[in-house]
Interface confidence: low
């Protein structure tokens, strides 16, 4: 760390005195202090001498000596007072600019430490400080106004009591600037607008900022609109509002509208689209397939997107059959508004029962008329199987009926021994029936198919099994011939009750 001679923190001299300040360091050293006249500087290697043979009040200030090559950045300082009985203050700057809530240092340095007890800060023309002005004083640095406010932008003077009278410094102008965090905040309403030709419309563009100096304009397809501006001041923010009122809209009013505001920090803009239509419209659509298949017992949400202007006057979900005359419970119907002109309507169908398959229609109405969107809901069922022994055209035949949805596939197995389900080790023969006869296939119902296996002679120590499967599951029925007649056995695990 450099060393200053004389080795005192403060030095008090009279005007006209000779002052010599010497700084010595390990390497080269530099002086830094208030800009003032009459100083001469002499350097030789590791020492530097600052001297004047005619000190004035303007030499009052703190002189700091630093060693640029020192990685620790050490420095030493000495404060010089040049106590001029006519000049109690040395003002280093006549304008100070800070942002709101920063501390503002008014750099009037006292030229005589003895005067510290009688100092005060006033505004020009002897006016007292504003209420709430919180300040402190340092004879080395001057007055600090703490957390300065915009309203404290004033001209100040430092006052010292000398021989019973107040002596003022030259004035210092404080400029407290509002902190402008960025471009003005913007709102443009509505975010989207639709009107029928001839209707009225209103678009409002507003911007706000803590500072009054900002501009706002509304433009239509890159053309700036001339709209009278309304101003306001709320919660310490200035607001400027542009309202575009259109009594009878036409197609030329349609297009993109941008609200643009700018200040010293930059520009903000936000846009909306205005659509002018010839007449009312109502469009229904769904992201889902209108033909739905769901496994019985599971749930389904049917969703319809509605785009409409003017707004809906009525809407409902209707069950169109074929199973019962029940209607969807209102509590299962839900409506959400995505924005002004788009809505989503959802019908929740939890734990679907066989009687709930069929057509579901969403109906909506606005001045443009009625529209409907219909979903077809088919339930999927795992196959149910039954086998009987009969004679067809004199031949012994095993007849397998399988019912489910989608249409089941049928496979016959012949295996050794008596079992309620053939396993691989027991299988003697397998027949696939690629085209079983469809007995019934009505919309929204199960499909029932029939497969025939002609058996000339029933082997008594064997089992004949009919297996049916579809995308939902499988079912089987084992037929065990016994001497007293044929015996059929559906495996327990394939009993099915919806």
């Amino acid at each position: 760390i450099p060393v200053i001679e004389p080795s005192v923190p403060e030095l008090v001299v009279k005007p006209g005195a000779t002052v010599t300040l010497r700084c010595v360091g390990n390497g080269s050293v530099e002086w830094d202090g208030p800009p003032s006249p009459h100083w001469t500087l002499y350097s030789d290697g590791s020492s530097s001498i600052l001297s004047t043979n005619n000190a004035t009040f303007q030499n009052t200030g703190t002189y700091r000596c630093t060693e640029p090559g020192d990685p620790l950045g050490g420095s030493a300082a000495i404060h010089l007072y040049v106590k001029d009985p006519a000049r109690p203050w040395n003002v280093l700057a006549q304008e100070v600019v800070v942002f709101e809530d920063q501390d503002a240092l008014l750099p009037c340095l006292l030229t005589d430490p003895v005067l510290e007890a009688g100092v005060s800060l006033v505004r020009v023309r002897g006016r007292p400080l504003m209420r709430h002005t919180n300040y402190s004083f340092s004879p080395w640095h001057g007055f600090t106004i703490h957390r300065a406010k915009f309203i404290q932008s004033q001209d100040y003077q430092c006052s010292a009591l000398m021989g019973g009278r107040k002596v003022m410094s030259i004035s210092i102008r404080l400029k407290v600037q509002k902190v402008i965090p960025g471009p003005p905040a913007l709102t443009l309403v509505p975010a989207e607008l639709v009107r029928i030709r001839g209707e009225a419309a209103q678009i409002v563009c507003s911007a706000s900022s803590v500072d009054v100096n900002f501009d706002v304009f509304l433009q239509h397809n890159n053309t700036k609109l001339a709209i009278p501006q309304q101003s306001d001041f709320h919660n310490n923010r200035y607001q400027k509002v542009l309202t575009l009122n259109l009594d009878q809209v036409d197609f030329q009013h349609a297009g993109n509208y941008s609200c643009v505001a700018s200040n010293v920090q930059g520009k903000h803009s936000t846009s909306m689209f205005f659509r002018v239509v010839e007449s009312a419209y109502l469009n229904l659509s769904s992201e889902q397939n209108l033909i739905q298949e769901v496994t019985v017992g599971e749930g389904l949400n049917l969703k319809v997107m509605v785009e409409a202007y003017p707004g809906l006057q009525g809407f409902n979900w209707t069950y169109l059959g074929p199973f019962s005359d029940h209607q969807p419970e209102p509590k299962l119907a839900n409506a959400t508004t995505k924005d002004t002109y788009r809505h989503t309507f959802t019908l929740s169908l939890p734990r679907l029962k066989p009687s709930e398959a069929g057509r579901y229609s969403f109906l909506a109405r606005n001045p443009g008329g009625w529209r409907a969107l219909t979903f077809e809901l088919t339930l999927r069922y795992p196959p149910e199987v039954s086998v009987i022994w009969t004679f067809i055209n004199g031949s012994g035949t095993l007849l397998c009926a399988a019912s489910g949805y989608p249409q089941p596939n049928v496979t016959w197995l012949q295996c050794s021994g008596h079992t309620d389900r053939c396993d691989e080790a027991q299988v003697l023969q397998v027949w696939d029936d690629p085209y079983p006869e469809v007995l019934s296939q009505e919309p929204f119902h199960k499909v029932t198919v029939q497969s025939l296996l002609t058996v000339e002679t029933l082997e008594h120590n064997q089992t004949y099994e009919c297996r049916a499967h579809n995308s939902v599951g499988s079912g089987s029925w084992a037929f065990i011939p016994i001497s007293a007649g044929a015996h059929t056995h559906p495996p327990d695990e394939f009993l099915f009750t919806p």
Epitope: R123, R127, P128, L129, M130, R131, H132, T133, F150, I151, Q154, V212, Q230, S231, F233, N236
Partner: antibody, heavy 119, light 112 residues
Framework: QVQLVQSGAEVKKPGASVKVSCKVS????????MHWVRQAPGKGLEWMGG????????IYAQKFQGRVTMTEDTSTDTAYMELSSLRSEDTAVYYC????????????WGQGTLVTVSS | DIVMTQSPLSLPVTPGEPASISCRSS???????????LDWYLQKPGQSPQFLIY???IRASGVPDRFSGSGSGTDFALTISRVEAEDVGVYYC?????????FGQGTKVEIK
């Protein structure tokens, strides 16, 4: 929201003094600048004086200088207006009204205090 | 002191019709920040004055949009686009540029 509640009506004799109070709620008095305005029966509004935040002091209208004193009790957020050497032409409704420190318009106003000067 | 002059002093109006009050100041009320320091107040019968317009043209919150302020420098106006029965009372302009604050003489608006 600032609210101002003034003291009740007063009847005074000529030469006497009257002191009207104005209680502030919703804000503290130090956050506001308080002004006093009077209105003689059937006449217009007349500004008497008020705290000027830019001057840091209370300014009085020339007409009332030396007769009026406006004070504040910040511990109770109450402002006072005292008018001395009353004469019959001081019969009026006296209103307190506030402005913010950075703004100059008066909002809100107190409900008014009728001071009648009569011998 | 700045002298404020209002006209007319009395204004009979018909509900639904527009009405306009003029206010002139003896010197410009335009501040260096670009705003005109002129306010408008309405005193309804038997009530305290209420704040309507500030900085020449800005409506106070809660003031209906049928009230509008205009003007700059020394000439100002308060316009009611469609007078309603509740708008009757005395309207005052006030300059807030400097102390002492000064009011216009007031304009009495009454239904014809």
């Amino acid at each position: 929201q600032v609210q101002l509640v003034q003291s009740g009506a007063e009847v005074k004799k000529p030469g006497a003094s009257v002191k009207v109070s104005c209680k502030v709620s919703g804000y503290t008095l130090t956050e506001l600048s308080m002004h006093w305005v009077r209105q003689a029966p059937g006449k217009g509004l007349e500004w008497m004086g008020g705290f000027d935040p830019e001057d840091g002091e209370t300014i009085y209208a020339q007409k009332f200088q030396g007769r009026v004193t406006m004070t504040e009790d910040t511990s109770t957020d109450t402002a006072y207006m005292e008018l001395s050497s009353l004469r019959s032409e001081d019969t009026a409704v006296y209103y307190c009204a506030t402005a913010g420190l950075e703004i100059r318009w008066f909002d809100p106003w107190g409900q008014g205090t009728l001071v009648t000067v009569s011998s | 002191d700045i002298v404020m002059t209002q006209s007319p002093l009395s204004l009979p109006v018909t509900p639904g019709e527009p009405a306009s009050i003029s206010c002139r100041s003896s010197q410009s009320l335009l501040h260096s920040n670009g705003y005109n320091y002129l306010d408008w107040y309405l005193q309804k019968p038997g009530q305290s004055p209420q704040f309507l317009i500030y900085l020449g043209s800005i409506r106070a919150s809660g003031v209906p949009d049928r009230f509008s302020g205009s003007g700059s420098g020394t000439d100002f106006a308060l316009t009611i686009s469609r007078v309603e029965a509740e708008d009757v009372g005395v309207y005052y302009c006030m300059q807030a540029l400097q102390t002492p604050r000064t009011f216009g003489q007031g304009t009495k608006v009454e239904i014809k």
